[in-house]
């Protein structure tokens, strides 16, 4: 029971964090108009990884595409690279850990298949997760060593009296979403590899059958002593039942306090 | 037909207050920022302070800050100027004005003529 | 405050003349962002509010006469009458309208020859 809820919370956790890094990607919100110390001006000015937004006290919003690829810093093409790496590996984590659920059931699925495609999935959760926080992080060390430049040349002389202000840009609400989001999609993909451990069965390489001795209460399978004395893995999680001999397939299909539902 | 009607005017006795109305028509009121701007006797405009549709932020020029306080009533489409601490620089025509495309003035009212003096 | 000078005080110009006027900010009005220039001018005829001719330095209010056009980008702003009629006699403000407060210009009036 443990496992399933562990795997399904898992699955959840990076649902809703790669949500958070889709919708982090997509906003525009990721540097805003630093206003503290600053001159108050009449517009708003923020930015995106694919465009920058200018909101007037009018509250018309203008925005404008980078319909540059080439004139464009190498660290938001880093920053946009890591973000898509992370969307595309969680949507594919995502895809694999559905067909991972313990709580669905796909044709004759073994539980070691679904071990692997929890791993799997987790794995890829973590790669996303990490992907995110790294862009992310990215670009806010970007964000902070242009802050702090602008604020050294705050004002520009123009010659004379005049003087044009430098607009600072601070932290803007996507990078918050999307650390958030990366932490997420982490402890998702966490959660499935923790996961995946309870759900690897115990490897076996024949049938067992379950016998109830009237004399003894003895388990007796083929095997020999390893089988008889409790010693074989395959006697871990399997119940032995009243009323003759089960097959291990069989045996597996019921639930017992043992099972994983 | 965008309409603004200033009303409230008259003659105040330095140190007084008086309370500006500005009547608003003929477009969605709630959705749009507004200025009040004066203008001294044979003077130039000066622009006394701004109000943004839901009511902040509202910016005051430094003049007439801490005396002067801009409000609105979307509901009623009535925008307010409540004056203060009256100074005879502060005789003026006062004009509304709707906040527009690059934070211009697009439409004015005809102005309300306030006059301090004892 | 930013500071808004405009030149010259006063102009006197026959009809049909071309005219031009100066508007001069002591900070750039440039915003980044869009590179856009956040200057309007405005006419007043006597006894009348302003009427908003220009915004964004160049774009021309609907309803207004072609003859009138703005340029000019950062500091420096020209308000041009292509044709001067009788009815543009008035006097003419350049304003801030990227930094608060918003200032206006001492305004150039236009007079008849």
């Known amino acids: 029971m443990a496992v399933t809820a562990c795997q399904g919370l898992g699955f959840v956790v990076s649902l809703i964090g790669i949500a958070g890094i889709i919708a982090a990607t997509c906003m525009d919100q990721w540097s805003t108009q630093d206003l503290y110390n600053n001159p108050v001006t009449a517009v708003f000015n923020y930015q995106g990884l694919w465009r920058s937004c200018v909101r007037e006290s009018s509250g018309f919003t203008e925005c404008r595409g980078y319909f540059t690829l080439l004139g464009l810093p190498a660290m938001l093409q880093a920053v946009r690279a890591l973000m898509i790496v992370g969307i595309v590996l969680g949507a594919i984590g995502l895809l694999v850990s559905i067909f991972a659920l313990k709580c669905i059931r796909i044709g004759s699925m073994e539980d070691s298949a679904k071990a692997n495609m929890t791993l799997t999935s987790g794995i890829m959760f973590i790669v996303s997760g990490l992907c995110a926080i790294a862009g992310v992080s990215v670009f806010a060390n970007m964000l902070v060593t242009n802050f702090w430049m602008s604020t050294a040349n705050m004002y520009t002389g123009m010659g004379g009296m005049v003087q044009t202000v430098q607009t600072r840009y601070t932290f803007g609400a996507a990078l918050f979403v999307g650390w958030v989001a990366g932490g997420l999609t982490l402890i998702g993909g966490v959660m499935m590899c923790i996961a995946c451990r309870g759900l690897a069965p115990e490897e076996t390489n024949y049938k067992a059958v379950s016998y109830h001795a009237s004399g003894h209460s003895v388990a007796y399978k083929p095997g020999g002593f390893k089988a008889s004395t409790g010693f074989g893995s395959n006697t871990k999680n399997k119940k032995i039942y009243d009323g003759g001999a089960r097959t291990e397939d069989e045996v597996q299909s019921y639930p017992s306090k043992h099972d994983y539902v | 037909e965008v309409q603004l009607q200033e009303s409230g005017g008259g003659l105040v006795q330095p140190g007084g207050s008086r309370k500006l109305s500005c009547a608003a028509s003929g477009f969605s009121f709630s959705s749009f920022g507004m200025h009040w701007v004066r203008q001294a006797p044979e003077k130039g405009l000066e622009w006394v302070a701004f109000?943004?549709?839901?009511?902040?932020?509202?910016y005051y020029a430094d003049t007439v800050k801490g005396r002067f306080t801009v409000s609105r009533d979307n509901p009623k489409n009535t925008l307010f100027l409540q004056m203060t601490s009256l100074r005879s620089e502060d005789t003026a025509m006062y004009f509304c004005a709707r906040n527009y495309y690059g934070n211009a003035m697009d439409y004015w009212g005809q102005g309300s003529s306030v006059t301090v003096s004892s | 405050d930013i500071m808004m000078t405009q030149s010259p005080l006063s102009l006197t110009v026959t009809a049909g003349e071309k005219v031009t006027m100066n508007c001069k900010s002591s900070?750039?009005?440039?915003?980044?962002?869009?590179?856009?220039?956040?200057l309007a001018w405005y006419q007043q005829k006597p006894g009348q509010p302003p009427k908003l001719l220009i915004y964004?330095?160049?774009t021309r209010e609907s309803g207004v006469p072609a003859r009138f056009t703005g340029s000019g980008s950062g500091t420096d702003f020209t308000l041009t009458i292509n044709t001067v009629q009788a009815e543009d006699l008035a006097v003419y403000y350049c304003?801030?309208?990227?930094?608060?407060?918003?200032?206006f210009g001492t305004g150039t009036k236009l007079e008849l020859k």
């Open positions: 109000i943004s549709s839901g009511s902040s932020p509202i």
């Open positions: 964004w330095a160049s």
């Open positions: 900070q750039s009005l440039l915003n980044g962002g869009n590179q856009k220039n956040y």
């Open positions: 304003q801030n309208d990227y930094f608060y407060p918003l200032t």
